[in-house]
Amino acid sequence: MEADKDDTQQILKEHSPDEFIKDEQNKGLIDEITKKNIQLKKEIQKLETELQEATKEFQIKEDIPETKMKFLSVETPENDSQLSNISCSFQVSSKVPYEIQKGQALITFEKEEVAQNVVSMSKHHVQIKDVNLEVTAKPVPLNSGVRFQVYVEVSKMKINVTEIPDTLREDQMRDKLELSFSKSRNGGGEVDRVDYDRQSGSAVITFVEIGVADKILKKKEYPLYINQTCHRVTVSPYTEIHLKKYQIFSGTSKRTVLLTGMEGIQMDEEIVEDLINIHFQRAKNGGGEVDVVKCSLGQPHIAYFEE
């Protein structure tokens, strides 16, 4: 804040070199600016917090399991342009988490109509040991999930170059990069274009022929000499990633039902799960074939729903 005051005094001096503002006036003005400053800082902080919260809402962190790929056939490309990129696409669907609170259970039936019937009956009397417990069946209120396609294109004509030293002017560095990457002794070849960004110290180099990029990428580094000094720049594949068909979905589960009203039970969860399973297997109780039961009598559990 002291620095702020000094700055303000300096500004006042610069703006009125001939006028001498009274100390009191001056002090009042500084106080006003300082107050305004504090107010603005608070506002910035508030907005930053809001922004962070908003960002969190739209972030998705998913552990995508490893998928085994089945190689089916070799495609014969119709023309060279099909060889200039390797493309692949992944369908990603997020699992929707649901927290089963203490005294709740989730039951999944094999058939949708059974689940609907159990919900429509609402109240169910389940015999748990010597207790006849009234549970309530409800639809499961799910949070929204996402589904999208990740489309990845790996270029066979372009490479990414990073860690380029900031030792030359932009036009000269562009020349230097083109010259270095065109030298066949280092695995280079004829360069079509160089897109260099001095600020990030990176470039995208496009070659004329297919295969040059692959040769260069066999090594992770490439020598770039500038005034007798060897700088080792990092080379990596040039990939373009597109997000396609992004869909947000929400709704209720068709085969799973939420059971509530078991707060007072002091028993092993697995035993209660078995008893619920037995009760809802019976048609006379409005049930049918059960897939799975998950019960929470102590700590809340997370259940994941997928399409």
């Epitope: 083109e178 010259l179 270095s180 160089v194």
Partner: antibody
């Protein structure tokens, strides 16, 4: 080889375009194509260079900026446009290829020259 | 700007003798120095590049040396055909200025 053309006798204030044509090779990333001049009985004076690679970056001697323009018109020709000519511009104008001798562009040399074309500025 | 200062402007020596030409750059040119020979009515001919590397076809009587800002061309076992004007030249990449190119003022070698 390289060959210059367009040299002429012109009046002060006039403009002139010189052309350099390469044969036996075409421009590539390993070269800068340049113009150098030599006034009668004087030394060599560098004017400008253009990178023969894809970027076509241009570089000029400080005295040449604004009045001289180097450009690549094809993969084998380079031109030098000169404006507001004065008697001091009277010289033999050489087209030269500046070649990168090492793999890294640290050692350069004008390893190919044209025979030169004479430009005379006189009223 | 890059400035190349060449000395002497003229030198004479007898056939079989040795001449030394000096070239000073206004800044470090990292041994990126070339030497040229020019005879009247002809374009220059490259003799040496990278301060000390002989261009193909150039006799080994021509020797280049130096580093930083100081460079030398030595011609030994002088022949009549060596009578010519010799120029040093450098080009320099830079972070703050255009890529510069400059020639020295030239040294006339007279063979007696």
């Amino acid at each position: 080889s390289l060959e210059e053309s367009g040299g002429d006798l012109v009046k002060p204030g006039a403009s002139l375009t010189l052309t350099c044509t390469a044969s036996g090779f075409s421009f590539s990333s390993s070269y800068y194509m340049c113009w150098v001049r030599q006034a009668p009985g004087k030394g060599l004076e560098w004017i400008a260079c253009i990178y023969a690679g894809s970027s076509g970056s241009t570089y000029y001697a400080s005295w040449a900026k604004g009045r001289f323009t180097i450009s690549k018109t094809s993969s084998t020709t380079v031109t030098l446009q000169m404006t507001s000519l004065t008697a001091a511009d009277t010289a033999t104008y050489f087209c030269a290829r500046e070649y990168s001798y090492d793999d890294y562009g640290d050692f350069w040399g004008f390893n190919l020259w044209g025979p030169g074309t004479l430009v005379t500025v006189s009223s | 700007a890059l400035v190349m200062t060449q000395t002497p402007s003229s030198v004479s020596a007898a056939v079989g003798g040795t001449v030394t030409i000096n070239c000073q750059a206004s800044q470090n040119i990292y041994t990126n120095l070339a030497w040229y020979q020019q005879k009247p009515g002809q374009p220059p001919k490259l003799l040496i590049y990278g301060a000390s590397n002989l261009e193909s076809g150039v006799p080994s009587r021509f020797k280049g040396s130096g580093s930083g800002t100081e460079y030398t061309l030595t011609i030994s076992d002088l022949e009549c055909d060596d009578a010519a004007t010799y120029y040093c030249q450098s080009s320099l990449y830079s972070r703050i200025a255009d890529r510069a190119n400059a020639f020295g003022g030239g040294t006339e070698v007279v063979v007696k």
